[in-house]
């Protein structure tokens, strides 16, 4: 079979959705006439070469936009960035492209996304809202790292 990315929508526990603003992902309260991004995600084909029991390693992109989430250090700080990249190009690579990979863990309806390149750093949004998505090590404090992921079929 041909592997293709799955599509999904994401919101956090405060019912904020991800929207694209000036090539940056931000979390905002859902409103009428707003178009949240649709997430594209696909599991890494080299799962056996990655850490066990940390979650399912996935590439995360924005559906139809050729943009993927990646983690890179700016100075000493791991940061979350959007890069122009075809998610299938990442999927087909001969090795895991760790800067673009996230361990997806599910507990009940909650999902977390941990950077493979920077273990212990998670995709998060500030509790204030209207802020860009970030990477954080601080779980359950000023930042929200739990998201609701709904797959679209």
């Amino acid at each position: 079979k041909i592997d293709t990315p799955q599509r999904g929508s994401i919101q956090d526990i405060n019912h904020r959705v991800w929207v694209l603003q000036d090539q940056t992902l931000i979390a905002v309260p859902r409103k009428d006439r707003m178009s949240p991004v649709t997430i594209a995600l696909i599991s890494c084909r080299h799962v056996e070469t990655l850490e066990k029991d940390r979650g399912n390693p996935i590439y995360l992109g924005l559906n139809g936009l050729n943009l993927c989430l990646m983690c890179a250090k700016v100075g000493d700080q791991p940061t979350l960035q959007l890069k122009e990249k075809d998610i299938m190009d990442l999927y087909n690579q001969p090795e895991p492209v760790k800067s673009f990979l996230f361990y997806h863990s599910q507990s009940g309806r909650n999902s977390t996304f941990e950077s493979v390149a920077f273990p212990g750093w998670f995709i998060a949004v500030s509790s204030e809202g209207g802020c860009p998505l970030i990477l954080t090590q601080e779980l359950g404090k000023a930042n929200t790292t739990d998201f609701g992921l709904t797959m679209l079929f």
Partner: antibody, heavy 121, light 109 residues
């Protein structure tokens, strides 16, 4: 600058084992994959296997599975290849190489200077 | 397991163009083989030239280009320089392992 410096030449008897080292500098070894490749006299290159130093997971060419063991010590940025049950046909120069993702693809961009392993009774 | 074959030797005139190829015994080479090309010059370390079939490694001169040609991976040197005299190895990816070719000795004469 990026460098991979390998240990010195070895002479071994058939049936023995050898352990070759590859010390990385100028980059974070955890951000890349380190491969081992060998070249027998007058022959082409032969891929042995690779390690992900950040995690320690390995892959091997089926031909070498069971005889080659690749390990890493991230505290010293060193990768090791241990080769067991040596035969005369294992006489070769053994190279470590970095497979690095840059832009859109992986490249075997930097290589060690090679370690000559001679197997002779 | 696939065998990867290269021309044993080729000669090019300075300023000329030459194409080295890399054939797989298991069929046509495709972009899914992520062809890499590596250069070995006498007395120097191996150096990566091309990855992912046609991407140049950082710092590699534009006269080196990678492509697919008639079901083979190809490395073309346009405007060959004396310093391009070397042995060139290709490597192809097959699902879970790499296979290298036997190398092409290029003479610039």
């Amino acid at each position: 600058q990026v460098q991979l410096v390998q240990s010195g030449a070895e002479v071994k008897k058939p049936g023995a084992s050898v352990k070759v080292s590859c010390k990385a500098s100028g980059f974070n070894i955890k951000d890349t994959y380190i491969h081992w490749v060998r070249q027998a006299p007058g022959q082409g290159l032969e891929w042995i296997g690779r390690i992900d130093p950040a995690i320690g997971t390995t892959r091997y060419d089926p031909k070498f599975q069971g005889r080659a063991t690749i390990t890493t010590d991230t505290s010293t940025s060193t990768v090791y290849l241990e080769f067991s049950s040596l035969r005369s046909e294992d006489t070769a120069v053994y190279y470590c190489a970095r497979l690095h993702y840059f832009g859109n693809n992986f490249f075997f961009d930097y290589w060690g200077q090679g370690t000559l392993v001679t197997v002779s009774s | 397991q696939a065998v990867v074959t290269q021309e044993p030797s080729l000669t090019v005139s300075p300023g000329g163009t030459v194409t080295l190829t890399c054939r797989s015994s298991s069929g046509a080479v495709t972009t899914s083989n992520y062809a890499n090309w590596v250069q070995e010059k006498p007395g120097q370390l191996f150096a990566g030239l091309i990855g992912g079939t046609n991407d140049r490694a950082p710092g590699v001169p534009a006269r080196f280009s990678g492509s697919l040609l008639g079901g083979k991976a190809a490395l073309t040197i346009s405007g060959a320089q004396p310093e391009d005299e070397a042995i060139y190895f290709c490597a192809l990816w097959f699902s879970n392992h790499w296979v290298f070719g036997g190398g092409t000795k290029l003479t610039v004469l």
